[in-house]
Interface confidence: low
């Protein structure tokens, strides 16, 4: 069980971004547990007045792909694909800068919402980043 595996996404919360594509999960139970937690997080986001349209347009799919990473089809063993670091940084430092500051200072939000740490992601030019999940965030000039 500790090796992880790939399974079709069966949830609802992220279906419009992931469809029924194959996602990486570490255990049989994990998809359902994450689905419950991300549904609660999205319910909280929906009632928040602190989320701008420009942020939510990309933050929501980014959170979905962070919670349910696509399987790396190029790998011989089950492996999750990372978010792209350049997009993660633009999301955190430009599009959602105010929202991130608010979220990181609010324990209730942090309890529900799992924010990617961009520094944990592979550098853009590294081999590990070659197959990263791209959300389609416009790159800043």
């Amino acid at each position: 069980e500790e090796d992880g595996f790939c399974q079709p996404y069966r949830g609802i919360a992220c279906a419009r971004f992931i469809g029924n594509r194959t996602v990486y999960m570490e255990s049989l139970h994990m998809q359902g547990e994450i689905e419950n937690q991300i549904t609660a997080a999205f319910t909280m986001i929906g009632t928040s007045s602190h989320l701008s349209d420009k942020c939510s347009q990309f933050a929501i799919p980014s959170l979905c792909h962070y919670a349910f990473p696509y399987c790396d089809e190029t790998s011989s063993v089950p492996k999750p694909r990372d978010l792209c670091r350049d997009e993660c940084e633009i999301l955190e430092n430009v599009l959602c800068q105010t929202e991130y500051i608010f979220a990181r200072s609010n324990p209730m939000i942090l309890m529900r919402l799992k924010l990617p740490n961009c520094e944990d992601l592979p550098q853009p030019e590294s081999p590990e980043a070659a197959n990263c999940i791209r959300i389609g965030i416009p790159m800043a000039d």
């Epitope: 992880g4 990486y24 570490e26 994990m30 937690q37 962070y66 919670a67 990473p69 999750p80």
Partner: nanobody, 111 residues
């Protein structure tokens, strides 16, 4: 080579608390998920709790509401806070990251 070293086990009375630690010799959050397993005498090893790099958690039904798993990335350490301990929680607790295992730490719950 990555090593996992558990600590924090011991003898505790029913209803008591313990906090297990698992120190990794590597940046622990680069594993997709890490977790705690346990093995009671004469029983199979079972998953207790698991946390993914995004902070998503899974708990076995028998420990839900009593145990809390967490990570401190700055210390490369995984924790298991165990409250309201019961006799049936007695086991050797193992830290796990993919195919890596710690040596285990014994938790004994007895009056």
């Amino acid at each position: 080579e990555v090593q996992l070293v558990e600590s924090g086990g011991g003898l505790v009375q029913p209803g008591g608390s313990l906090r297990l630690s698992c120190a990794a010799s590597y940046y622990i959050s680069r594993f997709y998920a890490v977790g705690w397993y346990r093995q009671a005498p004469g029983k199979q090893r079972e998953l207790v709790a698991r946390i993914s790099s995004g902070g998503w958690t899974y708990y076995a039904d028998s420990v839900k509401g009593r145990f809390t798993i967490s990570i401190d990335n700055s210390k490369n350490t995984l924790y298991l806070q165990m409250n309201s301990l019961r006799a049936e929680d007695t086991a050797v607790y193992y830290c796990n990251a993919r195919n890596l295992w710690g040596q285990g730490t014994l938790v004994t719950v007895s009056s």
